[in-house]
Amino acid sequence: ELCDDDPPEIPHATFKAMAYKEGTMLNCECKRGFRRIKSGSLYMLCTGNSSHSSWDNQCQCTSSATRNTTKQVTPQPEEQKERKTTEMQSPMQPVDQASLPGHCREPPPWENEATERIYHFVVGQMVYYQCVQGYRALHRGPAESVCKMTHGKTRWTQPQLICTGEMETSQFPGEEKPQASPEGRPESETSCLVTTTDFQIQTEMAATMETSIFTTEYQ
């Protein structure tokens, strides 16, 4: 089941999925001046069996001015730095995503890919939030959001994160230890049962990740 909305946006924060649940789709978008090859896929799809998940289809872009198809290459470091994604492209993978059953890793970049990745998430997907560079967490409760099914409708739980400019905060008595909770909203506040995610095993690890994994500013 696809999630109806995008994950919540938080002022001066970005979000990232550490892995993508089977059923997730990633649009094959090309940067300006390029287009999908004629017979090319519209999207990549995370699929798999009980032991292994991977992305089906390959995205390929070609110059709008020529008919030549492009080969799949990894961008040079300068190009990589330019790329922004909806969930913040990360220079390293802090979690061993291959060991997470039913999930795919971040897909590798393709040549002349658009600067922003558009994902279509499925129920059970979890994303993690971090303040952007120049901001820090004034308050951090459970700083993740999960797409859940409630009353036949999908919704994202609310991440509890407030970011403030580093010079704005009156007092920082001690560094916060991020809390890891699978719920964006306490169960006592929901009026019926909701589906849970099998992605919660990552919460503890991802909630304590170094901020260095979140390098791309995206608002």
Partner: antibody, heavy 118, light 107 residues
Framework: EVQLVQSGAEVKKPGATVKISCKGS????????MHWVQQAPGKGLEWMGV????????NYNQKFKGRVTITVDKSTSTAYMELSSLRSEDTAVYYC???????????WGQGTLVTVSS | DIQMTQSPSSLSASVGDRVTITCKAS??????LSWFQQKPGKAPKTLIY???RLVDGVPSRFSGSGSGQDYTLTISSLQPEDMATYYC?????????FGQGTKLEIK
Amino acid sequence: EVQLVQSGAEVKKPGATVKISCKGSGYTFTDYAMHWVQQAPGKGLEWMGVISTYSGNTNYNQKFKGRVTITVDKSTSTAYMELSSLRSEDTAVYYCARSYGNYPFDYWGQGTLVTVSS
Amino acid sequence: DIQMTQSPSSLSASVGDRVTITCKASQDITSYLSWFQQKPGKAPKTLIYRANRLVDGVPSRFSGSGSGQDYTLTISSLQPEDMATYYCLQYDEFPYTFGQGTKLEIK
């Protein structure tokens, strides 16, 4: 049921200090930050500051020029707002309000009237 | 600080009327704007957040729109119980700042 219950009305003399409490219940108190908002009689709303109920981090509105101090007692799920050097223009209703995810103030306290009079 | 200029400061309208209240921020607040309704002697109640997201339980006659610096609250068909004062709030930057309020009266 989520509730924010504030302490009762106060009458203070100019120059005094007032401390108002706001007790949260029905939810995990330390997951949600707490804000304080002032409303003078017949006037609009003024944001005073916010505290992280988890870490104690605060951010204040400089309009209150260091007269406001927000604290938290996690053991009793209570936030406090202290306003010092009171003057007559501090006569107002003071609200605590919980911050919920990507929007502030999903639940409010009932308000506490503070009257400053000589 | 970001200034929020709300207009009109008061208005009178009839039941069934379409009512609009506007808020202008002194800088781009990237849609981090909420609308509140406050009735006399009561705490404010959130109607809209993120400029256009309706809070659960709020009647669908209320809607929000706008981006950048300019935002609007619309009541599509005014009801007697909508008599109240309405405030906007920006929460893009600290300190959070409210509009001056719009007092809505029923003719």
